[in-house]
């Protein structure tokens, strides 16, 4: 498929222009070479117009031009002075006409409307309102005020002064007489229809002094906005619909065979299953504006996107709209990372996460995405040094491995971490991924003790046993903060017994802390990785406490406590809008709120790695 | 080559404080923990306190509590003990010890050449 | 506190000889299967050198004829065969417990 996109169909009138837009992957080799805008024959082939390199076909001469933008992967190609001969098959193209990439787009220039004089016209979104304005003289001002519609050769009735509504305009429209000082009646029309479009005539009186005025009516059906994304990458659909609809239920509708329009999201909390775990609407400011994200686009989720306002949460005819025709550009630059991660209840995960690699000094961000409502993602770690408060000791956010990718690891896991998560930055807003991470059957690969207590002033000693299929992976000790885990130096003390039907390549490694003081008190994790890239962690809570009596502290799985309890912890939630200090783009539109629900998680924890598109078990 | 380098002997007045300093070199600074030593002329040697430069954690002998404070310097990785109201009995020999903090297998493996404090008027 | 008792509180043994060294605390300083007890010898004007750690493991540069032994209370050094240069004074020190304690020392001479 040609990763070149443009307008499928422009649309225009005689003696207009129109500026088409055309995107392509802004690779070194896209942005220099030749882009072109030829028109297709009946026999094939497509003739050159107009091409960056200089070239004016004399069709176009004086009257067209071609710009280039390298920076933003676009090129627009502008063209004035339209008549009816310009209708037609068009390509814009990147390369030799004939090599396939290229975009087709049909152009339509029809004849302007033969008005009548002294017609005004009003020019109308689909959805909208419109005003139309009918003076009169003295003479009529007690006499009948109506307003027709010419279809064909007749006037049909649209409304009258009397009462009478053409059962077409039912419940939205008016007619308004002013007050005695002025000369006028209005007619409002509401939800505007693409057929309400044509000429009118409001007239007042019905005899031969009776005062006419002509209308024409143009609904435009909005063209829709192109916004070309990469595969794997989000789009923001920003919708302002005007504060007339400020309290009308708003949604997200992406059409499919026909007229159809399939909700993809709305306020009165329908969601596509397609887009579960990976769309956001955001709550709307107080002039009706709302905004949807999308992230982890599919091929699929190419299309015509509308956005409106209706009562019913889904498209109707009068339903105010925008529009956008959304490409999924499969020359993504976004990498392939897994798009699911398993891990087993007391175990941990290990979630690489991609971000743009011109961004190395960006803030990242991994959020829970919650569904309830219409979506939202409170943040649960940045790599500022903020950790939410029931995550602390079970997550951690490491740049490593660097160089386009960070990773998050989560430890001690239980059923509630089932969810979708995304991975983002306060750069580029395009790089939001999400990882769904899904608790299966099994037990945790890593064996440590559970509640450690150490004694002032003594040596702790903490094991961790790693089963045999770990035997070629990096084995680690660190303890955790909320900037990382600082690794620690452990000792490898032979093979473990604490597997069965496993040989000598099982390992036991110890942590060992001489001198324990109050400051050591905390989260550690034993794990694996394979040079910066992290594999499955275990969590122990050391707590430090004076010396009693005397006595031997051996800390073995055998005599290790059950998991920590569960505590329930202050929600330590921040609106997200609170890390946008530094850069106002940063979720401008994904306002999380206050999160009180999430508990402590005091369980231990197991991490995957595997395939692009799936995590599981622990090859790498 | 590891070294613990500690300042100058000090003649000093009672009731006034001083900080020994222990300069290291040769070694990963925040893997060990600093022990400092007093041995008084002729006595026994006794454990004052030990300082993990990785957190700052510290563990005093309760007879050395309120009279000194042990402190580290990272990015110098030197060690550092005040004494504070001294008097004729804080008199000695003052030595710091390293001590590998990650092995149950470790001890106080190498000492610095001691600082000589004298308290008189 | 756990309290170290040295014994002899000096000794005087013949070159060749074998010099034992005795240390007891007033409880266990075992722990994780190790004792926490380490000698030291000290020469005059010089700090301290480690010699034996864990009980029995001899530290670095430390010539074979320093050996340790003992678990629990009771330590012992043994220096076989005894040579001019190890004339000083050894203390034993237990590492299991703060405060760190060390024994009253042994002054060990050439007879």
């Known amino acids: 498929k040609s990763p070149i996109f443009g307008p499928e169909e422009v649309n225009s009138v005689e003696g207009n222009s129109v500026s088409i837009t055309c995107y392509y992957p802004p690779t070194s080799v896209n942005r220099h070479t030749r882009k072109y805008w030829c028109r297709q024959g009946a026999r094939g082939g497509c003739i050159t117009l107009i091409s960056s390199e200089g070239y004016v076909s004399s069709k176009y001469a004086g009257r067209a031009n071609l710009t280039n933008f390298p920076e933003n992967g676009t090129f627009v190609v502008n063209i004035a002075q339209l008549s009816q001969d310009d209708s037609g098959r068009y390509k814009c193209g990147l390369g030799i006409n004939s090599r396939g990439l290229s975009f087709d787009v049909s152009l339509e220039v029809s004849q302007g409307p033969g008005l009548l004089n002294d017609t005004k016209v009003y020019t109308v979104d689909l959805g909208r309102t419109v005003t139309i304005n009918c003076p009169f003289k003295t003479e009529n001002a007690q006499k009948r005020k109506s307003l027709y519609k010419q279809i064909g050769l007749y006037p049909v009735l649209v409304i009258d002064s009397s009462g009478y509504v053409n059962p077409n305009y039912t419940g939205r429209i008016r007619l308004d007489i002013q007050g005695t000082g002025q000369l006028l009646f209005s007619v409002v029309i509401n939800q505007l229809r693409l057929s309400d479009a044509g000429q009118y005539l409001c007239q007042a009186g019905d005899d031969s002094n009776s005062n006419k005025k002509n209308a024409d009516l143009q609904v435009l059906k909005p063209e829709p906005e192109l916004v070309y994304e990469d595969l794997r990458g989000s789009v923001t659909f920003h919708c302002a619909l005007g504060p007339e609809v400020a309290n009308v239920a708003k949604f997200l509708c992406r059409q499919s065979s026909g007229e159809n329009c399939d909700v993809v999201v709305n306020t009165l909390g329908k969601r596509a299953p397609a887009f579960e775990g990976r769309i956001l609407l955001n709550p709307q400011d107080k002039d009706g504006s709302f905004s949807v994200v999308i992230t982890g686009l599919r091929k699929e989720d190419a299309g015509r996107y509308l956005c409106g306002a209706h009562s019913d949460g889904q498209l109707q005819e009068g339903s105010p709209i925008q529009a956008w025709q959304l490409f999924v550009n499969e020359e993504s630059t976004i990498p392939r990372s897994p798009t699911v991660v398993k891990g087993v209840a007391g175990g941990s995960v290990a979630v690489l996460c991609p971000y743009n690699r011109k961004e190395s000094k960006s803030i990242k961000y991994w959020c829970l995405w919650e569904g309830a409502q219409n979506g939202r993602c409170p943040l649960l770690v940045d790599s500022e040094g903020w950790v939410k408060a029931q995550y602390e000791g079970r997550l951690s956010l490491l740049e490593e491995p660097g160089n386009g990718t960070f990773t998050v690891i989560l430890n001690q896991l239980t059923s509630r971490d089932a969810g979708f998560y995304w991975c983002l930055t306060n750069g580029d807003t395009l790089w939001r991924t999400t990882v769904e991470i899904k608790i299966i059957e099994g037990e945790p690969n890593l064996k440590v003790p559970g509640n450690v207590t150490a004694v002032l002033g003594e040596t702790l000693k903490v094991p961790c046993h790693f089963p045999c299929k770990f035997s070629s992976y990096e084995k680690y000790w660190c303890k955790w903060n909320n900037t990382g885990c600082q690794a620690l130096p452990s000792q490898d003390e032979g093979p473990s017994k604490a597997f069965v039907n496993c040989d000598e390549n099982s390992r036991l490694v110890s942590l060992t802390l001489n001198l324990v003081t109050r400051a050591d008190e905390g989260w550690y994790w034993c794990g694996v990785k394979q040079g910066h890239f992290y594999g499955e962690t275990a969590a122990v809570y050391v707590a430090v406490e004076e010396r009693k009596a005397a006595g031997s502290r051996d800390v073995s799985l055998a005599k290790a406590d059950a998991a920590p309890d569960e505590k329930v912890l202050d929600s330590g939630f921040r609106e997200i809008e609170n890390k946008a200090i530094q850069d106002p783009r940063l979720f401008a539109e994904e306002k999380a709120v206050a999160d009180t629900r999430d508990q402590a998680d005091g369980s231990r924890a197991s991490v995957d790695s595997g395939s692009s598109e799936e995590q599981g078990g622990s090859s790498r | 080559e590891v070294q613990l380098q500690q300042s100058g002997p000090d003649l000093v007045k009672p009731g006034a404080s001083v900080k020994i300093s222990c300069k290291t070199s040769?070694?990963?600074?925040?893997?060990?923990?600093m022990h400092w030593v007093k041995q008084s002329h002729g006595k026994s040697l006794e454990w004052i306190g030990g300082?993990?430069?990785?957190?700052?954690?510290?563990s005093y002998n309760q007879k050395f509590k309120g009279k000194a404070t042990l402190t580290v310097d990272k990015s110098s990785t030197t060690a550092y003990m005040e004494l504070r109201g001294l008097t004729s009995e804080d008199s000695a020999v003052y030595s710091c010890?390293?001590?590998?903090?990650?092995?149950?297998?470790?001890?106080?493996?190498?000492w610095g050449q001691g600082t000589t404090l004298t308290v008189s008027s | 506190d756990i309290v170290l008792t040295q014994s002899p509180a000096s000794l005087a043994v013949s070159l060749g000889q074998r010099a034992t060294i005795s240390c007891r605390a007033s409880?266990?300083?075992?722990?994780?299967?190790?004792?926490?007890m380490n000698w030291f010898q000290q020469k005059p004007g010089q700090p301290p050198k480690l010699l034996i750690y864990?009980?029995?493991n001899q530290g670095s540069g430390v010539p074979g004829r320093f050996s340790g032994s003992g678990s629990g209370t009771d330590f012992s050094l043994n220096i076989h065969p005894m040579e001019e240069d190890d004339t000083a004074m050894y203390f034993c020190?237990?590492?299991?417990?703060?405060?760190?304690?060390f024994g009253g020392g042994t002054k060990l001479e050439i007879k």
């Open positions: 409880e266990s300083v075992d722990n994780y299967a190790i004792s926490f």
């Open positions: 864990a009980a029995s």
């Open positions: 020190q237990q590492s299991k417990a703060v405060p760190y304690t």
């Open positions: 300082i993990n430069p990785n957190n700052g954690g510290t």
């Open positions: 010890a390293r001590y590998y903090r990650y092995d149950v297998l470790s001890a106080m493996d190498y």
């Open positions: 040769g070694y990963t600074f925040i893997e060990y923990t």
